[in-house]
Interface confidence: low
Amino acid sequence: VPDKTVRWCAVSEHEATKCQSFRDHMKSVIPSDGPSVACVKKASYLDCIRAIAANEADAVTLDAGLVYDAYLAPNNLKPVVAEFYGSKEDPQTFYYAVAVVKKDSGFQMNQLRGKKSCHTGLGRSAGWNIPIGLLYCDLPEPRKPLEKAVANFFSGSCAPCADGTDFPQLCQLCPGCGCSTLNQYFGYSGAFKCLKDGAGDVAFVKHSTIFENLANKADRDQYELLCLDNTRKPVDEYKDCHLAQVPSHTVVARSMGGKEDLIWELLNQAQEHFGKDKSKEFQLFSSPHGKDLLFKDSAHGFLKVPPRMDAKMYLGYEYVTAIRNLREGTCPEAPTDECKPVKWCALSHHERLKCDEWSVNSVGKIECVSAETTEDCIAKIMNGEADAMSLDGGFVYIAGKCGLVPVLAENYNKSDNCEDTPEAGYFAIAVVKKSASDLTWDNLKGKKSCHTAVGRTAGWNIPMGLLYNKINHCRFDEFFSEGCAPGSKKDSSLCKLCMGSGLNLCEPNNKEGYYGYTGAFRCLVEKGDVAFVKHQTVPQNTGGKNPDPWAKNLNEKDYELLCLDGTRKPVEEYANCHLARAPNHAVVTRKDKEACVHKILRQQQHLFGSNVTDCSGNFCLFRSETKDLLFRDDTVCLAKLHDRNTYEKYLGEEYVKAVGNLRKCSTSSLLEACTFRRP
């Protein structure tokens, strides 16, 4: 089989027939050096999954539940292409599983016990697996058989397809529990009708159900959604209030050597020639000899799943939690303590050392998880492998787009009420050597630049956002002659000035000596023309305050700031000569860990915060010899956010807009993956 062949897995005679037709029609439109199809027939989807893992086939399209199976070891498959529905302009690749209630019913998610429930059908995703999976550990014991536990949890239900003899309560609202449209409460519309008629108190459906059944907004306004944080939201706010976000139908392939680019090339060409309304003789999204053969008949096309996205990220934390609960059926005997230990994400070797020291001192309240880049850490927090970390505003933006929430903010000024007063922010500045007297904001082209890291606020988002507005393109590596911007592509001129050795060169962590605020300033001192840092960086590293050999003899007076009006000012005049105000760094976590992270961090800073006077003999949370490990070294305390508890509110409209404008220049694979889940 030539290397450009995609071996498609079919699970029935009818699918195999359609696959052969797909193969033959693709041959007729694709040049001989292009991708081709071969067909492999297996008895079931699980057999297909095993065949792909064993390199006997390359691709198959699966529902969400099977994507989870495909991801589990030893299969280790990943999503590579998603079917979309709706229009090309507004493609829908996911649906949201929601809990719909009547507006005046007055109960929350944590008050469902004893209510009457309407389900689309036993074993179906939005109507059963997701809500019951998420409620699993609240079901009365014994939880097996599951139907009995559910019957004892709700005071009555309609769960079509359930066994009405063994579990009559599950059929109480729809006598007989009929498993077809003959049962008026079957399926999405049926479950909603069960709620609408007043038979049930809550309907577990998908977000579009209510719109499909109630065309009139006034009618829809009589209903609300239950959110996982025990609040309610209007039905059109399903993106912020759902039980899980579920992919509709997805092509999977091997994680390693999985031909994902070839599969995309094949399907992209296939949709061009045989997609919706393209060809009479063969239609990709049509099944004359059955239903949903190879692909869903209702699909409109394909979208490439961003390469950064593994199955866990694609399926989402809530969905994975629900399915894992149902599959594994284990619940903690009792919570081990008021809060489980917070798993802190540490970047590379230096942060891990400090984190381990913190962990020992915290007596089990903090545990450490390592990752090589900030984005890897954010991904680990998303999927539950880690819980929290402190981030620069640029990464708070990415984390927010990925569904994480800010929980506490670093404060940098001493005040009586530090923990209660989050600050307005710090200043992003451009520093130059006083001796380079002809250098201004207006003639930076061709100069050597030093950045904290790509995607960070003072070092990248603010200066590059301003620059983008001026030059209207993203080729910053052409604007500067060379530089060090950790996180850039290794062959970019913006890695040329970096000092890391071997694989560590230009890495966005402390293994690269020019990483972060201190690193960017060092880059200016030793090689560069301009450094983009925060207003405190120069004073913190001059006048003997940084004992490292490169810094110990530096004098603040030898550096100046570039102002946006083309003038220059002394370093201490940052308030009148800066690029923008930057939001302080903030701790982020998942919504479900917000309360515990808040509590434990406040305890930890009382023990190890800036009230500790002697850091030579004691652990200090906010100290690391100017390396800004885990937190910025000038942090005085972690402050409550009050109502600024979403990434948009925390960062502020202006900054979110600035970063949004820079998105077209973004090289962030994680941001690309998260915007795929939530455009």
Epitope: N230, E338, C339, C596
Partner: nanobody, 130 residues
Framework: HVQLVESGGGSVQAGGSLRLSCAAS????????MAWFRQVPGKEREGVAA????????YLTDSVKGRFTISQDNAKNTVYLQMNSLKPEDTAMYYC???????????????????????WGQGTQVTVSS
């Protein structure tokens, strides 16, 4: 729904003791997690103690450990807060709370875990004078 009725509040000298009671009636499953919160005027409501009634597992906030205990009488659907060695800073309105918490019972005991509470009592005043 769950109805919660607190009793046992009052005035006491520093170093003294009080025992608060909270009687739950109605849908007692929704009270599988019971907690005591307290609030001083102008301040946030803060968690003091919680108990997982199905397992008898107790949680206490650091400032009251060693002085307060939380217990239950399943037969009477009542939860107690025994407060010993009272200090003037314990003066507050004490509220009983119930939930079957979607996350975990300990989260009720967080001060900011108030958002996880399903039902509240009316409160009982505790005043400790020096």
């Amino acid at each position: 729904h769950v109805q919660l009725v607190e009793s046992g509040g009052g005035s006491v000298q520093a170093g003294g003791s009080l025992r608060l009671s909270c009687a739950a009636s109605g849908d007692t499953y929704s009270s599988k997690c019971m907690a005591w919160f307290r609030q001083v005027p102008g301040k946030e409501r803060e968690g003091v103690a919680a108990i997982d009634t199905s397992r008898g597992r107790a949680y206490l906030t650091d400032s009251v450990k060693g002085r307060f205990t939380i217990s239950q009488d399943n037969a009477k659907n009542t939860v107690y807060l025994q407060m010993n060695s009272l200090k003037p800073e314990d003066t507050a309105m004490y509220y009983c709370a119930a939930s079957n918490t979607f996350y975990n019972c300990g989260a009720l005991n967080l001060g900011i875990g108030a958002g996880l509470v399903a039902y509240w009592g009316q409160g009982t005043q505790v005043t400790v004078s020096s």
